[in-house]
C-alpha cells in the first residue's frame, strides 16, 4: 500500500456511476471510497463492472470493514455476494432470514455451495432457525452441509428438515453429528409406523445406540448390508449374534462378503465362534470356544 498512487485531480467520484467503468484499475484503487460503495451497493450490482473492477471494490469494502461487513451492507449485497469467500462470511453476523434467502437466491446455480453453507452456518450461529423454506432455497446443494455445521448449530435445525435428508448426505458426518441427527430424525418420524419408519430412519442409523438397535431388531426390518455397514462400531459390537440375525433377517448371508472389513470384522471379533457357526455361513474371526474375554475398559476402572 506504500506504493499506492494518489487519485488524479478531478477523478474522486462522489457517487457510484457508469463513469467508473472507464477508470484504470489503479485509479479505482486510489479514488474509490469503501463507504460510498457500501451506500450504493445497488448500483455496484447494476452497472456492468468487470470482475477485476469488482474485486477492487471488494478489497475496498474489506479495508473499510476489517471485522466483517455489517448486516445493513450484507442485506444489500445482491450479486456482489458472488465475490465473497466463505472465510469472509464466517466473520459476519446475520440475523435476518430474509437476508439469507435473498443471498441464497443469488448463489443458486453459481457453484457457490461453500458460500451458501457458510452463510447458513453464520445465521444459525446468530440464533437463527433453519426452516424448510431455507432448505428449499439451498436448492440442489446436498444436505451433507449439515455435517459442516457445529453441533451447537445443529441444535437449531428443526426436526422437519430430516425428511429431506438422503442416504449419501451423511457420509462425511462425525459420530457426534450423527448422534444429534439421529435424535432429530427420531422425533421427526415419531408418527410414522412400521416399515415406512424404518425406511426413513435407516439413513440416520449411524447415530443409533446399541439400545436403539436392539429395539429395532424386534421389528423384522430386514436391514440391508449397506445400512448395517454404516452403523457405528461401538453400537454394533454390543449386539449378539441372535440380535444381528433378527436385524438383518434374510440379508444375514451378506455378512460373509464383508467379514474381513470394518465394522463387520469388529463385530465378529466380539462374538463367540460357536454362535457364529450356528449361522452356517462359514464366518470366521470369532472368539475361540473356551476363551475368556476380559473387558479392559472395566478393569482400568478398578485399577
Amino acid at each position: 500500500d506504500a506504493e499506492q498512487k494518489a487519485c488524479p485531480p478531478g477523478k474522486e467520484p462522489y457517487k457510484v456511476d457508469e463513469d467508473l467503468i472507464f477508470y484504470q484499475n489503479w485509479e479505482l484503487e486510489a479514488c474509490v471510497d469503501g463507504t460510498m460503495l457500501a451506500r450504493q451497493m445497488d448500483l455496484v450490482n447494476e452497472i456492468p463492472f468487470t470482475y477485476e473492477q469488482l474485486s477492487i471494490f471488494k478489497h475496498k469494502l474489506d479495508k473499510t470493514y476489517p471485522q466483517g461487513y455489517p448486516e445493513s451492507l450484507i442485506q444489500q449485497l445482491g450479486h456482489f455476494f458472488r465475490y465473497v469467500s466463505p472465510e469472509d462470511i464466517h466473520q459476519w453476523n446475520v440475523t435476518s432470514p430474509d437476508t439469507v434467502k435473498t443471498l441464497l437466491k443469488v448463489s443458486k446455480g453459481q457453484k457457490m455451495n461453500a458460500q451458501a453453507i457458510a452463510l447458513v452456518a453464520c445465521y444459525l450461529r446468530g440464533g437463527g432457525q433453519l426452516d424448510e423454506d431455507m432448505v428449499k432455497a439451498l436448492g440442489d446443494i446436498p444436505l451433507s452441509y449439515l455435517c459442516d455445521f457445529s453441533p451447537q448449530d445443529l441444535h437449531s435445525v428443526p426436526s422437519s428438515v430430516m425428511w429431506l435428508v438422503g442416504p449419501q448426505d451423511l457420509d462425511k458426518c462425525s459420530q457426534r453429528h450423527l448422534g444429534l441427527l439421529y435424535q432429530k430424525a427420531c422425533s421427526a418420524f415419531q408418527n410414522v409406523s412400521g416399515l415406512e419408519y424404518f425406511e426413513k430412519i435407516k439413513t440416520f442409523l449411524g447415530g443409533a445406540s446399541v439400545k436403539d438397535l436392539r429395539a429395532l431388531s424386534q421389528h423384522n426390518v430386514s436391514m440391508d448390508i449397506a445400512t448395517f455397514k454404516r452403523l457405528q462400531v461401538d453400537s454394533l459390537v454390543g449386539l449378539s449374534v441372535a440380535e444381528v440375525q433378527k436385524l438383518l433377517g434374510p440379508n444375514i448371508v451378506d455378512l460373509k462378503t464383508e467379514e474381513d472389513k470394518s465394522p463387520v470384522r469388529d463385530w465378529l471379533f466380539r462374538q463367540h465362534q460357536k454362535d457364529l457357526d450356528r449361522l452356517g455361513l462359514g464366518l470366521q474371526g470369532g472368539i475361540p470356544n473356551g476363551y475368556l474375554v476380559l473387558d479392559f475398559n472395566v478393569r482400568e476402572a478398578f485399577s
Epitope: 457508469e18 463513469d19 467503468i21 472507464f22 452497472i47 456492468p48 463492472f49 468487470t50 470482475y51 477485476e52 473492477q53 469488482l54 450479486h79 458472488r82 446455480g109 453459481q110
Partner: antibody, heavy 119, light 111 residues
Framework: QVQLVQSGAEVKKPGASVKVSCKAS????????INWVRQAPGQGLEWMGI????????KYAQKFQGRVTMTRDTSISTAYMELSSLRSEDTAVYYC????????????WGQGTLVTVSS | DIVLTQPPSVSGAPGQRVTISCSGS????????VSWYQQLPGTAPKLLIY???QRPSGVPDRFSGSKSGTSASLAITGLQSEDEADYYC???????????FGGGTKLTVLG
C-alpha cells in the same frame, strides 16, 4: 429528436486507416456515451468500444486494442472512430450507437457507414 | 468470437408464436441485463427489449423477453410479415468488460 448522422462510405487499401464520424443532435452530447459496433457482410454485430464524450475516456474491445482510436469533438457534437492497419476482414458497415444511462443499452443508432477494404 | 448462442433461423406462419433462445454464461447473461435488437433488411438495428423484459415505447406488446439463469429468450406472438428480420440478443460481459452479441437469428414469416 435524437439523431446520429454518420459520414459516407469509404473504400480503402489494405494497411491504410479509416476515420468514420458520427454527428449527434437532439440531446446533450456530453451526457451519453457513444459506442461503435460493426457488421461484416452477411454477419452478426460486433462491439468495438465505447467513448465518454464528457472526458474523452475510452474502453476498447480486446480484439481491436492497439488498432482502434475513438475520439470526440464536443464543440461540434461529433464522435470519431479510427481503425488502422486495415485488412480485407475489416470490410463492414460501422455503426455508432448511443448508450442510454441506467439501462446500458443502445437506444439510438447511426445509419451506418460502409467501409470496403480492397486492393 | 460469438459469446452468446442463438439459433441461426426460426420460422412461423402469420398469427403464430415463435421464440428465439439465447444462451450465455454467468459472466454475461447470468449477471447482467439482456437486450434484444431487431434489424430489418438494409437498416440499422433497433432496440426491441431491454433489462431482460422491458419494452421501449413504440414496441408492440407482441414482443416479450424473459431470462432464467444464463439463458434468455424472445417471444413474438401474432406473427406479422413485417416481423421478418434478424434478431440479436446482447449483454455486457463482466469477464472482460465488453458488450457481447449473439450470432443473430433470421426470422422468416411463412406464406
Amino acid at each position: 429528436q435524437v439523431q446520429l448522422v454518420q459520414s459516407g462510405a469509404e473504400v480503402k487499401k489494405p494497411g491504410a486507416s479509416v476515420k468514420v464520424s458520427c454527428k449527434a443532435s437532439g440531446y446533450t452530447f456530453t451526457g451519453n456515451y457513444i459506442n461503435w459496433v460493426r457488421q461484416a457482410p452477411g454477419q452478426g454485430l460486433e462491439w468495438m468500444g465505447i467513448i465518454n464524450p464528457h472526458g474523452g475516456d475510452t474502453k476498447y474491445a480486446q480484439k481491436f486494442q492497439g488498432r482502434v482510436t475513438m475520439t470526440r469533438d464536443t464543440s461540434i457534437s461529433t464522435a470519431y472512430m479510427e481503425l488502422s492497419s486495415l485488412r480485407s476482414e475489416d470490410t463492414a458497415v460501422y455503426y455508432c450507437a448511443r448508450w442510454h444511462h441506467g439501462t446500458w443499452i443502445f437506444d439510438y443508432w447511426g445509419q451506418g457507414t460502409l467501409v470496403t477494404v480492397s486492393s | 468470437d460469438i459469446v452468446l448462442t442463438q439459433p441461426p433461423s426460426v420460422s412461423g406462419a402469420p398469427g403464430q408464436r415463435v421464440t428465439i433462445s439465447c444462451s450465455g454464461s454467468s459472466s454475461n447473461i447470468g449477471s447482467n441485463y439482456v437486450s434484444w435488437y431487431q434489424q430489418l433488411p438494409g437498416t440499422a438495428p433497433k432496440l426491441l427489449i431491454y433489462n431482460d423484459n422491458q419494452r421501449p415505447s413504440g414496441v408492440p406488446d407482441r414482443f416479450s423477453g424473459s431470462k432464467s439463469g444464463t439463458s434468455a429468450s424472445l417471444a413474438i406472438t401474432g406473427l406479422q410479415s413485417e416481423d421478418e428480420a434478424d434478431y440479436y440478443c446482447s449483454s455486457w460481459d463482466r469477464a472482460d468488460g465488453s458488450y457481447v452479441f449473439g450470432g443473430g437469428t433470421k426470422l422468416t414469416v411463412l406464406g
